[in-house]
Interface confidence: low
Amino acid sequence: AVNGTSQFTCFYNSRANISCVWSQDGALQDTSCQVHAWPDRRRWNQTCELLPVSQASWACNLILGAPDSQKLTTVDIVTLRVLCREGVRWRVMAIQDFKPFENLRLMAPISLQVVHVETHRCNISWEISQASHYFERHLEFEARTLSPGHTWEEAPLLTLKQKQEWICLETLTPDTQYEFQVRVKPLQGEFTTWSPWSQPLAFRTKPAALGKDT
């Protein structure tokens, strides 16, 4: 048996994936554990093997179907269990009645591209990935721009309070290399959190025209 405090946290990507992290102080690193998902009103159930991500935490992804298939709705409740092998039997380590649309974390935005770049501004667009059609307009975004000599943590956050998959960055410095990231969050869900940040998009502003003030 393992003692110590444990935490079991899962998020639904709004389509066909539930990602889970289980942490347990004092657990043995080589313990074999799984997450079992049992929906209350579906015929399927699913299992994934928890793999170590740090000294005392494990993670896995419950793949519920094709990436863009709508496998759960708001009225679903999924019983999630952490099962760890103890000798010849499995022991229930954690259990959660999981409401998928109260625990949302979407996939990071994809397909970032520079639509138009000038000396002082840059227009960037992106796409959301594997987001439920149910959300329609009810999404918000945060974006950040990495300037030379700064870190991502220092970058001010730009908030887009609507489903707007583009941004026009202003007051940029000419002939300067920047990087840009964006993340997305549904408006719904008590425990909903931001998606991971997108892959950074690198771009360079155009040089100022010779003989002109910048």
């Epitope: 709705t73 708001t74 009225v75 059609h133 329609e136 009810h138 408006l187």
Partner: nanobody, 123 residues
Framework: EVQLVESGGGLVQAGGSLRLSCVAS????????MGWFRQAPGKEREFVGI????????DYADSVKGRFTITRDNAKSTVYLQMNNLKPEDTAVYYC????????????????WGLGTLVTVSS
Amino acid sequence: EVQLVESGGGLVQAGGSLRLSCVASGRTFSATNMGWFRQAPGKEREFVGIISESGRNTDYADSVKGRFTITRDNAKSTVYLQMNNLKPEDTAVYYCALGRDYFATDTRQYNYWGLGTLVTVSS
């Protein structure tokens, strides 16, 4: 201020049909999601179904799936609940509610409520 007014309730025999209407006034109706809830005597208010702002997406409680249909007419600021094959256990006061988020089955997620319309299904 938003106002929601339900109508169409009444007494119907088991197996019969009713169509409830909910008219919204006081704000842009087309930019909101609308839910139907019901409350039977001595019970908590429960989710019946919901329709998204465009009307393309709907969701229903298991107990009414296949029997009830929600539609909306944004030009008339009205949402409808078509109830077929009614059962005595469908007897309740039916409320429409206006909420910001599509997937809201919890009454706490709704800001505005109508006063309700009574549906009685006799056996």
